[in-house]
């Protein structure tokens, strides 16, 4: 809303609030070793951290959610840290007829917000 | 991914998994009573509940997140329940020059998934 101001400074201290973090993962970790051929190691950016009141609110709904969580914490959950956008990544994988390249648009997070 | 199958049945029992729930809220609850004139009571559908492994996965990223959370629960958070779509709502509010109607497209959740 025009009357709520999402904030970008973390009141909990450095690295505690919702942010993008790189997680190394092998194809084995993902259970993909039987069908993905390359890359064999992925840098998976993920959204981690807490969402204190009005921090990086995704939209009006998230601002309302934060407000109502303050009033009814048992009934309304706090907003949580999820991807706001993604970076495409190309995977080479086996198919019935051989090998194929495919772009995945929703695999690696590029930015995060509180929703 | 082609090798992960999001599921829609909740393994935790009825009403425990990610779902849409209606929360009644007054303008006072939202801190909007000074600028929103109507409606004076809102039905705010919100996404609540847990996101067990592969339940209503938003996309490939969410499936990966669920998998890595199982492997590294301290490092990778579980997916969480957030809106997948919204229902518009028209608010009448005061402006500097009088009264205005405005459609908010991101205020009331219409569907939920685990991201």
């Amino acid at each position: 809303s025009a009357h709520a101001h999402p904030r970008d400074s973390c009141p909990l201290g450095p690295g505690r609030c919702c942010h993008l973090e790189t997680v190394q993962a092998t194809l084995e970790d993902l259970g993909w070793s039987d069908w993905v051929l390359s890359p064999r190691q992925l840098q998976l950016s993920m959204c981690v951290g807490e969402c204190p009141h009005l921090y990086r609110s995704a939209n009006t709904h998230a601002q309302i959610k934060a407000r109502l969580h303050g009033l009814q914490p048992d009934k309304v959950p706090a907003p949580c840290c999820v991807p706001s956008s993604y970076t495409p990544v190309v995977l080479m994988h086996r198919t019935d007829s051989g090998v194929s390249l495919q772009t995945y648009d929703d695999l690696v997070a590029r930015g995060c917000h509180c929703a | 991914s082609a090798h992960a199958h999001p599921r829609d049945s909740c393994p935790l029992g009825p009403g425990r998994c990610c779902h849409l729930e209606t929360v009644q809220a007054t303008l006072e609850d939202l801190g909007w009573s000074d600028w929103v004139l109507s409606p004076r009571q809102l039905q705010l559908s919100m996404c609540v509940g847990e996101c067990p492994h592969l339940y209503r996965s938003a996309n490939t990223h969410a499936q990966i997140k669920a998998r890595l959370h199982g492997l590294q629960p301290d490092k990778v958070p579980a997916p969480c329940c957030v809106p997948s779509s919204y229902t518009p709502v028209v608010l009448m509010h005061r402006t500097d020059s009088g009264v205005s109607l405005q459609t908010y497209d991101d205020l009331v959740a219409r569907g939920c998934h685990c991201a």
Epitope: - | T22, S33, D34, L37, S38, P39, R40, Q41, L42, Q43, S45, T87, P88, V89, V90, L91, M92, R94, V99, L101, T103, Y104, D105, V108, A109, R110
Partner: antibody
């Protein structure tokens, strides 16, 4: 420009039910509330109830509580008003109208005549 | 329930002349936000009602500026500065402060 198009006239027996529909043509409900009112022949307007987005629960006038059910289907942009246990006094033109909450009813349906007669 | 009382019941008018309709509520329609939760509607013969004024004094989109609403609390007035032939019909005030929403009994405006 959105118009609200209501279902056709009905003749009903006392004790039966009627369900009137109200479809947004040329658009959707677009986040507006839907109110229902009625007008008995030669009489004034009487508010029955309404429903606001996300169209999950309705608000009814105490007079009609237990007899009226207002619903809306966003996928078809159609609202419904069902009135049960009809009596002759329910003979009226029934209107749907869109508003902001219960205020500012700026688009009205053409009305549906419901006649209750044995 | 809030009772809305309109006067007069019938108002014969001359085209080009002003006209005034009164509406009284059994309790104040002034909200703590400073706005009066009162609308005015016109129902032309054989037609559905149409919105003229909302929140006591705000003209609805497309409504000619010869229509104006005033008043606060329990006493409200709809004025037509210069009546035109197309203004005939029944005028209703409606309170939206609390449910059930209630309408006045109507004022029938007709050409003399």
């Amino acid at each position: 420009q959105v118009q609200l198009v209501q279902s056709g006239a009905e003749v009903k027996k006392p004790g039966s039910s009627v369900k009137v529909s109200c479809k947004a043509s040329g658009g959707t409900f677009q986040g507006y509330a839907i109110s229902w009112a009625r007008q008995a022949p030669g009489q004034g307007l009487e508010w029955m109830g309404g429903i606001i987005p996300p169209y999950a629960t309705a608000n009814y006038a105490q007079k009609f509580q237990g007899r009226v059910t207002i619903t809306a289907d966003e996928s078809t942009s159609t609202a419904y008003m069902e009135l049960s246990s009809l009596r002759s006094e329910d003979t009226a033109v029934y209107y749907c109208a869109r508003g902001v909450g219960e205020l500012h009813l700026d688009v009205w349906g053409q009305g549906t005549m419901v006649t209750v007669s044995s | 329930d809030i009772v809305m009382t309109q006067s007069p019941l019938s108002l014969p008018v001359t085209p080009g002349e002003p006209a005034s309709i009164s509406c009284r509520s059994s309790q104040s329609l002034l909200h703590s936000n400073g706005y009066n939760y009162l609308d005015w509607y016109l129902q032309k013969p054989g037609q559905s009602p149409q919105l003229l004024i909302y929140l006591g004094s705000n003209r609805a989109s497309g409504v000619p500026d010869r229509f104006s609403g005033s008043g606060s609390g329990t006493d409200f007035t709809l004025k037509i500065s210069r009546v035109e032939a197309e203004d005939v019909g029944v005028y209703y005030c409606m309170q939206a402060l609390q449910t059930p929403i209630t309408f006045g009994g109507g004022t029938k405006v007709e050409i003399k």
